[in-house]
Amino acid sequence: HTAAQDNCTCPTNKMTVCSPDGPGGRCQCRALGSGMAVDCSTLTSKCLLLKARMSAPKNARTLVRPSEHALVDNDGLYDPDCDPEGRFKARQCNQTSVCWCVNSVGVRRTDKGDLSLRCDELVRTHHILIDLRHRPTAGAFNHSDLDAELRRLFRERYRLHPKFVAAVHYEQPTIQIELRQNTSQKAAGDVDIGDAAYYFERDIKGESLFQGRGGLDLRVRGEPLQVERTLIYYLDEIPPKFSMKRLT
């Protein structure tokens, strides 16, 4: 499956243009912004999604302590450069020739520099901590029910094997989902934890990337789980390189 054959749409990415011009008249979909062909049977890479988002018309719109090397995406949106596989290029630059290095989820991991800045390799983000605060409920959720439902969600909606959901922590009202995926663990065809986390983040914010599907309706044993705050921490296989100035 590359796309829904019947009406030629991309179930996993609504930010695409699809037409039956693939081999044998098959439906083929291309991401907005980059024009790259996407596989609609799986999640589209975050880089292509960010690029598409920047090209689209603008609308008004027992807990883990993150390590000292954890990154938070403070820079927000930018128009990224993606490689031919749809991954982030290690070096990103803006229109004013300001450049910086990013990790595999596109988050800046160095100070900003000029065009002479070198980023030798794309450093993999192997550990993502999704920190959620849910709205008040009658009582706390059952931890094992919550764990099971979130694992099911990541498997069925985001196609992430549960072996990459390292843990689900819960101390009402805080939920933490730990995603882990080393380079050696990730087989061909496995969804990247960075892409799954991005789809989840957009779902939680009510900005679903899925084509023609209802928004995310998260329930634990029938009880709605409504998220009022999300924070995502990214840990790379190699710690980031920031000057001391940034850390003070």
Partner: antibody, heavy 119, light 111 residues
Framework: QVQLVQSGAEVKKPGASVKVSCKAS????????INWVRQAPGQGLEWMGV????????SYNQKFKGRVTMTTDTSTSTAYMELRSLRSDDTAVYYC????????????WGQGTMVTVSS | EIVLTQSPATLSLSPGERATLSCRVS??????????MHWYQQKPGQAPRLLIY???NLESGIPARFSGSGSGTDFTLTISSLEPEDFAVYYC?????????FGGGTKVEIK
Amino acid sequence: QVQLVQSGAEVKKPGASVKVSCKASGYTFTDYSINWVRQAPGQGLEWMGVISTYYGDASYNQKFKGRVTMTTDTSTSTAYMELRSLRSDDTAVYYCARYGDGYNQFDYWGQGTMVTVSS
Amino acid sequence: EIVLTQSPATLSLSPGERATLSCRVSESVDSYGNNFMHWYQQKPGQAPRLLIYRASNLESGIPARFSGSGSGTDFTLTISSLEPEDFAVYYCQQSYEDPYTFGGGTKVEIK
């Protein structure tokens, strides 16, 4: 309560195809993928593949690739498994089984469909 | 593919006795402390029934005399005191890696 009800026994000739159905009830069909497992007489269990009821696409055991097709009909909450080019060693009980919540365990099983391949 | 080896092939015991079934895996099915190993019971003419998931978690509705242990490549299913209805075939299964595979089974029979 969750139930998976399969179609009845089949007798097929070598080279023919068989299509087994698995009707789900008692839960939201598109929330859980469906696996297919077979068991030859007196033998162990063999996983054939899994179909996403949410997306409609399947992942097959390499052993059956090219001969098996798994599909779903969300309007009737039914999963199907078609096996082509049948041989005598395909004689087995075929089970559908639902993924459990968190760890890809199979928490509910159909009652099984006996498929006999004989000339 | 991951190969699961169960032993013994047959276990002859009397009701009330303790049963210990072993499952050895060709490579680790542990991911960050989560073991993708499950146990099923099958009686003649019936579909398998999930007993234990994630190596040691008791499935809802399964009696507490069943327990699972182990991690990585060595796993055990224990039935603390055999009841007449426990005489059946038991299978271990890994869901760490596609293709998912089952052990050859251990038959627990009445002595």
